[in-house]
């Protein structure tokens, strides 16, 4: 008997009430694999969810979040409110990133600016609430400084001696 059911393709179910004939999934249901004894109910994308992909007899519907929200969890199981760049979502709503932190997305938390000096770099562009600092070469990466030089040349011009 099991062999009969295993012949039922995706999009059908093995109908015990009808001598294990393969019956098509009813409307608003699907089976994504063969040999199923029942079809699963299609997911409905309602409220803050919107349909990204319609349900078919062989695959479940896929949901997205409506504008102003973003997906969380596997297969977009939840929608969370967007904030602006430079903010993070707290229990009290969207709050600006504290000084020294940034968030360049509409979701997630504010993260600390990179500490360039830890890598022996210098700050090329300061950080903002929306952007991390940009680290660049330190002065010592660009030239060896006065250590590379012969003794500085003596002053040669009245009123214009090197400082």
């Amino acid at each position: 008997l099991q062999d009969l059911c295993s012949n039922c393709p995706a999009g059908t179910f093995c109908d015990n009430n009808r001598s294990q004939i393969c019956s098509p999934c009813p409307p608003n249901s699907f089976s994504s694999a063969g040999g199923q004894r029942t079809c699963d109910i299609c997911r409905q994308c309602k409220g803050v969810f919107k349909t990204r992909k319609e349900c078919s007899s062989t695959s479940n519907a896929e949901c997205d979040c409506i504008s102003g929200y973003h997906c969380l969890g596997a297969e977009c199981s939840m929608c969370e409110q967007d904030c602006k760049q430079g903010q993070e979502l707290t229990k009290k709503g969207c709050k600006d990133c504290c000084f020294g932190t940034f968030n360049d997305q509409k979701r997630g938390i504010c993260r600390p600016w990179t500490n360039c000096s830890l890598d022996g770099k210098s700050v090329l562009v300061n950080g903002t609430k929306e952007r991390d600092v940009v680290c660049g070469p330190s002065p010592a990466d660009l030239s060896p400084g006065a250590s590379s030089a012969t003794p500085p040349a003596p002053a040669r011009e009245p009123g214009h001696s090197p400082q």
Partner: antibody
Framework: QVQLKESGPGLVAPSQSLSITCTVS????????ISWIRQPPGKGLEWLGV???????NYNSTFMSRLSINKDNSKSQVFLKMNSLQTDDTAIYYC?????WGQGTSVTVSS | DVVMTQTPLSLPVSLGDQASISCRSS???????????LHWFLQKPGQSPKLLIY???NRFPGVPDRFSGSGSGTDFTLKISRVEAEDLGVYFC?????????FGGGTKLEIK
Amino acid sequence: QVQLKESGPGLVAPSQSLSITCTVSGFSLTTYDISWIRQPPGKGLEWLGVIWTGGGTNYNSTFMSRLSINKDNSKSQVFLKMNSLQTDDTAIYYCVRVDYWGQGTSVTVSS
Amino acid sequence: DVVMTQTPLSLPVSLGDQASISCRSSQSLVHSNGNTYLHWFLQKPGQSPKLLIYKVSNRFPGVPDRFSGSGSGTDFTLKISRVEAEDLGVYFCSQNTHVPWTFGGGTKLEIK
């Protein structure tokens, strides 16, 4: 953010002197050395000299007798003075932090 | 003075090709502090030079990863893995190890 801007006379008569001021922003002259580099029309780059963070200077020996570089850290300004200009000193003069260059100031030596 | 010899003088390429520019110095560019102050710049027409690579192989922030630098001692190379239109211009190598700082004569990257 880091910026260097040269301001010069544009036209200099032969045998006269050239003075260019470089005003920097976004960093301190006590942290970075500043060089002067020039580029004659259609030619390569020529290093003139450097003023180190501590105020000491080094010059390209080719220009040593007629070049002076100074700075004012508090005003974020570096000064180039070159004497006895000739027509072959016609060039774009750049104020340079190595990783950032000014836009250059064009100097033409002509009577 | 340290002489920097750049080859080739002109480099015709097709877009998408790899390009390679060589720079040789007349003496070692290894400073007593262990660093090698060999930098690469790109100058586009009417613009000031822009730093691409510092200390032989370090890409300056914002420089695409198709640019890479290599070498040691007196022999250095700049490679562009897939040339794009915006890469055209004159490339200079520069040494800041020894005073006076000196530059290569430049390599003009142009469309074949």
